[in-house]
Interface confidence: low
């Protein structure tokens, strides 16, 4: 003897990403010689048994048996969200509800507010915005592999009344190590299923030069050829180098090249050499003390910087 529940259809709630496909499945144990029917939130019949009732090519029959009616809706739009009803026309009519939730996919975030020509110790503020999410997405910031703590995500309803625009800003003080770094804004949302949707802004930081003097070869001997490389670092790269030898007036040489060449080392070349590397951000002077000894022993040489 069948219980009343055996004629009660059952279904389940479904969540689908906008543009995706959702399958609505309705089952019943005892159909009492009646057909199952699906209708949409506007109470329009979609399928009655295997018969299509609504002319919408997105809606297709998946399974129609006395005990099951399954349909698929492809290219789901936000407007398709709502309660779908499965009915069986027994006495009395029995229904089951399937709540279809459509997720709005957030758009690729947009970063604004970057000002070029940032200088070391300047404060940078970047803004990030992403539209189209439902429910509202969350934004996170990072600099390279390091997380940046931006302000809490602001949420604003889109004009369609269904999706949201989220925005966040981050403020940080830049250092010379940040030159060339990527500031990344990522949007986190269940519709992305863990996929990364982010935008990066590479920043340029202008900073004062540094320099060091590198001898080539590292242990020069009398009679050898020696190059003193003044290795300038900075942004912009040093454009001008002033070489001078302590006690030598005027300075040895002003050059746009960073190397000082000794074609044939003499003892008289011994002394302390200074290289001033200059860019439009400032100057830096490096020192190198050269001791030219006899050809056989390895001469002592030292380098100091400030």
């Amino acid at each position: 003897n069948l219980s009343q529940d055996d004629s009660q259809p059952w279904t389940s709630d479904e969540t689908v990403v906008a543009g995706g496909t959702v399958v609505l499945k309705c089952q019943v144990k005892d159909h009492e010689d009646s057909s199952l029917q699906w209708s949409n939130p506007a109470q329009q019949t979609l399928y009655f048994g295997e018969k299509r009732a609504l002319r919408d090519n997105r809606i297709q029959l998946v399974t129609s048996t006395p005990h099951e009616l399954s349909i698929s809706i492809s290219n789901v739009a936000l407007a398709d969200e709502g309660e779908y009803t499965c009915s069986i026309f027994t006495m009395p009519v029995r229904t089951a509800k399937s709540l279809v939730t459509v997720l709005g996919i957030p758009q690729k975030p947009i970063i604004t507010g970057y000002k070029s020509s940032l200088r070391e110790k300047d404060t940078a503020t970047l803004n990030c915005q992403s539209s189209g999410s439902k429910p509202a997405a969350r934004l996170t910031w990072r600099k390279g592999d390091q997380e940046l703590h931006g302000e809490p995500t602001r949420i604003q309803e889109d004009p369609n009344g269904k999706t949201f625009t989220v925005s966040s800003s981050v403020t940080f003080q830049v250092t010379r190590e940040d030159d060339g770094a990527s500031i990344v804004c990522s949007v986190n949302h269940e519709s992305l299923k863990g996929a990364d949707r982010s935008t990066s802004q590479r920043i340029e930081v202008l900073y004062t030069p540094t320099a060091m003097i590198r001898p080539d070869p590292p242990h020069p001997r009398e009679g050898q050829k020696l190059l003193l490389h003044c290795e300038g670092r900075g942004n912009p790269v040093p454009q001008q180098y002033l070489w001078e030898k302590e006690g030598s007036v005027p300075p040895l040489k002003m050059t746009q090249e960073s190397a000082l060449i000794f074609p044939f080392l003499n003892k008289s070349d011994s002394g302390t050499y200074g290289c001033t590397a200059t860019s439009n951000m400032g100057s830096y002077k490096a020192y190198y003390t050269l001791n030219v000894n006899d050809p056989s022993p390895v001469p002592s040489s030292s380098s100091t910087y400030h």
């Epitope: 590479r202 190059l227 912009p236 090249e257 960073s258």
Partner: antibody, heavy 119, light 113 residues
């Protein structure tokens, strides 16, 4: 007339060596950075190496580092490219070119010299 | 290394018509301290060495006809020939000299339709 003329190309076996020369005339050679650029048959242009005006700064593409050496003799207005450990894929026309810092484009080119590496 | 990508690979244009060649760099070649784009355009005719047309992305080399112009900034650049002449048939290359190794685009072959 401002002119660059390359020489020294030819046929060489894999593993062999060649020295290319580039003779400059019509301008103050010692005031310009110089470059070597190559072009394999039917292919595009590929930068090889550069040398600063006084010869103290040199930079080369990774594919020639340790094999090719660029040098210059400002007294003779000559640019050189010493090519060692040559490989079949080094087969190309080799051009020397002038690179003025005020433009940073290569404004004067030689006619090129053909290097063929084959056994 | 900075990768330079030209489009199209080949182009056929009628005499007197406009020809446009695009060049994209994999990273910006704009140097903020002097606001210059380190990009040049060259023309190469069969059996000849390349000829410098444009440097700093938009400065015409002396002696180059004014129908040749360069534009763009950062990563996207364009060489335009406003009215194609028969002698413009050649392969055109863009090149960055922002950082070594200096790299060229793969070339665009320009023909007459």
């Amino acid at each position: 007339e401002v002119q660059l003329v390359e020489s020294g190309g030819g046929l060489v076996q894999p593993g062999g060596a060649l020295r290319l020369s580039c003779s400059a005339s019509g301008f103050t050679f010692s005031g310009y950075w110089m470059h070597w650029v190559r072009q394999a048959p039917g292919k595009g242009l590929e930068w090889v190496s550069q040398i600063s005006s006084s010869g103290t700064i040199i930079d080369s593409a990774d594919f020639v580092k340790g094999r090719f050496a660029v040098s210059r003799d400002n007294a003779k207005d000559l640019l050189y490219l010493q090519m060692n450990s040559l490989r079949a894929d080094d087969t190309a026309v080799y051009y020397c070119a002038r690179g003025p810092l005020a433009k940073n484009g290569f404004d004067i080119w030689g006619q090129g010299t053909m290097v063929t590496v084959s056994s | 290394d900075i990768v330079m990508t030209q489009s199209p690979d080949s182009l056929a244009v009628s005499l007197g018509e406009r020809a446009t060649i695009n060049c994209k760099s994999s990273q910006s070649v704009l140097y903020s301290s002097n606001n210059k784009n380190y990009l040049a355009w060259y023309q190469q005719k069969p059996g000849q060495p390349p000829k410098l047309l444009i440097y700093w992305a938009s400065t015409r080399e002396s002696g180059v006809p004014d129908r040749f112009s360069g534009s763009g900034s950062g990563t996207d650049f364009t060489l335009t020939i406003s009215s194609l002449q028969a002698e413009d048939v050649a392969v055109y290359y863009c090149q960055q000299y922002y950082s070594t190794p200096y790299t060229f685009g793969q070339g665009t072959k320009l023909e007459i339709k």
